[in-house]
Interface confidence: medium
């Protein structure tokens, strides 16, 4: 059987476990004895349409209810588990008064009033946070939703939204305590080179020392397998066998747009012109694949000073 | 045409360990990754682990670390899988295959029986 | 890990007839799913990588669409060589997943 919860002198409006897309009429009883739920709105506890309605409820309501929707061919028979709690007299709202949790993240910032569409509500919905009422403007309530603008891990708590159910002519009171927590939402794509440009030529100055920086993106959180390196003709630095040139290790950078990146540079002490026939080769890789930028060195043209 | 060519069927006992070769050819080996993935008989497909020749770094599926091994020749364009303390369960083809996320090469598969 | 799994388990389809398969993914892996076609005795074939992406030589009645966690994949007029088994793969993180495999056969 399924279970539903509400808070003593609150609105609580249940539907049948069983409705599916039904439209047959669904009839409510007490479990225990059978006895059949009147649809007579002056009742405390009545049936509308496939709701139960308990307007209040009180703490004795709490018990199982059996829905039977008759159709045609068939009767279908739902049991429904009813408790009703008293109010917790603090803030902490114990776990199984909660619904189920919202993850959040800086593209998912939205918490949905539970249970709300079963009711007969009218705007605003009051939000409160661990029992304080949400009065900053990053808070913002919009029919059954609260949105928050530039969410941080410190707006993770116990949201709690509350409306009035209106209802012959009297409004209740409904509460509904939902826990948010915020995600760092990385994620993950095919290497981007930033620096160099493919296929780039880099000015060079024979017997001076050269360094070449090669940068690469890969997204925003873990990365496995992300490295970035250089290749001389095809060849890792460390297996070139040429001391002059050397390969300082990858050091990780944040890019302008929040995105994990990684610089490794090549460095030459001093250029000869055997260096200017190889091919250098910055490499960016990770799970997802490999990119190369092939960079050519040529002799810096001397300025002419006539 | 590009293509990998695995050894042959291996029988092996259990607590022994069995090394499966996959010779590249067609392409340029080191600038793509190697995977292994086995296929128990009439199950689906397992990935055990990635090899990536220019890094000559390997990575392995939690399931089997401690217990896989994948290398890789330059020199002959040959990656290699090596799992040791086979045990009953470990009967399986193996397959090597080549890509980096999605896997567009595979080898012929490797028949690996582990029986006492 | 990222869980795949893959409906239904078994498809019963005529000759000629449309097949739609599904793939759904734990979490989501943007497009970086692929899809494969594995013949009884024999290795898989990719078919789609990018999550809509068809692999070299493959025919164009093998489709692929959706992003994030919810993934298909179409034939559109069933051949008698279609009839085997597909997987879908994930290749946004580590470990790399393969869903359980969806057997298409004869009807």
């Known amino acids: 059987s399924k279970s539903s919860w509400g808070l003593e002198n609150e609105a609580l409006i249940v539907r049948c476990p069983q409705r599916g897309r039904s439209t047959y009429p669904v009839e409510w009883y007490y479990s225990d004895t059978n006895e059949s739920i009147p649809t007579q709105k002056r009742n405390r506890i009545f049936v509308s349409r496939d709701r139960l309605k308990f307007l209040p409820a009180r703490v004795e309501d709490s018990g199982i209810y059996a829905c039977v929707i008759r159709s045609p061919n068939l009767n279908k028979t739902g049991y429904l588990n009813v408790t009703i709690h008293k109010k917790p007299p603090s803030c902490n709202i114990p776990d199984y008064l909660m619904y189920s949790t919202v993850r959040g993240s800086d593209k998912n910032f939205k918490i949905t009033c539970p249970t709300i569409d079963l009711y007969n509500w009218t705007a605003p919905v009051q939000w409160f946070k661990n029992c304080k009422a949400l009065q900053e403007p990053r808070f913002r309530a919009h029919r059954s939703y609260l949105f928050i603008d530039n969410v941080t891990h410190d707006d993770e708590g116990d949201y709690t939204c509350q409306f009035t159910h209106a209802e012959n002519g009297t409004n209740y009171i409904v509460t509904a305590t939902r826990s948010f927590t915020v995600e760092e939402k990385g994620f993950s794509m095919f290497p981007v080179i930033t620096n160099p440009p493919y296929n780039h030529t880099m000015e060079v100055e024979i017997g001076k020392p050269a360094s070449i920086a090669c940068s690469a993106c890969f997204g925003k959180g873990s990365h496995f397998l992300a490295d970035v390196l250089w290749q001389i003709n095809k060849t890792v630095v460390g297996n070139f066998g040429e001391a002059r040139i050397q390969e300082e290790e990858g050091r990780n950078e944040s890019s302008s747009n929040d995105m994990d990146c990684l610089t490794s540079v090549l460095r030459i002490t001093g250029v000869t012109e055997k260096d200017l026939s190889l091919e250098y080769d910055c490499l960016a890789l990770n799970l997802h694949g490999m990119i190369r930028h092939t960079i050519r060195l040529r002799r810096k043209q001397p300025i002419d000073h006539r | 045409q590009v293509q990998l060519v695995q050894s042959g069927a291996e029988v092996k006992k259990p607590g022994s360990s069995v090394k499966v070769s996959c010779k590249a050819s067609?392409?340029?080996?080191?600038?793509?990754?190697m995977h292994w993935v086995r296929q128990a008989p009439g199950q689906g497909l397992e990935w055990m682990g990635v090899i990536i020749p220019v890094l000559g770094a390997a990575k392995y599926a939690q399931k089997f670390q401690g217990r896989v091994t994948i290398t890789a020749d330059e020199s002959t364009s040959t990656a290699y899988m090596e799992l040791s303390s086979l045990r009953s369960e470990d009967t399986a083809v193996y397959y090597c295959?080549?890509?980096?996320?999605?896997?567009?090469?595979w080898g012929q598969g490797t028949m690996v029986t582990v029986s006492s | 890990e990222i869980v795949m799994t893959q409906s239904p388990a078994t498809l019963s389809v005529s000759p000629g007839e449309r097949a739609t398969l599904s793939c759904r993914a734990s979490?989501?892996?943007?497009?970086?799913l692929a899809w494969y076609q594995q013949k009884p005795g024999q290795a898989p074939r990719l078919l789609i990588y990018g999550a809509s992406t068809r692999a070299s030589g493959i025919p164009a009645r093998f489709s692929g669409s959706g992003s994030g966690t919810e993934f298909t994949l179409t034939i559109s007029s069933l051949q008698s060589e279609d009839f085997a088994v597909y997987y879908c793969?994930?290749?946004?993180?580590?470990?790399?997943?393969f869903g359980q495999g969806t057997k298409v056969e004869i009807k």
């Open positions: 295959a080549k890509g980096w996320g999605a896997f567009d090469i």
């Open positions: 979490q989501s892996v943007s497009s970086y």
């Open positions: 793969q994930q290749y946004y993180s580590y470990p790399w997943t």
């Open positions: 067609g392409y340029t080996f080191t600038d793509y990754y």
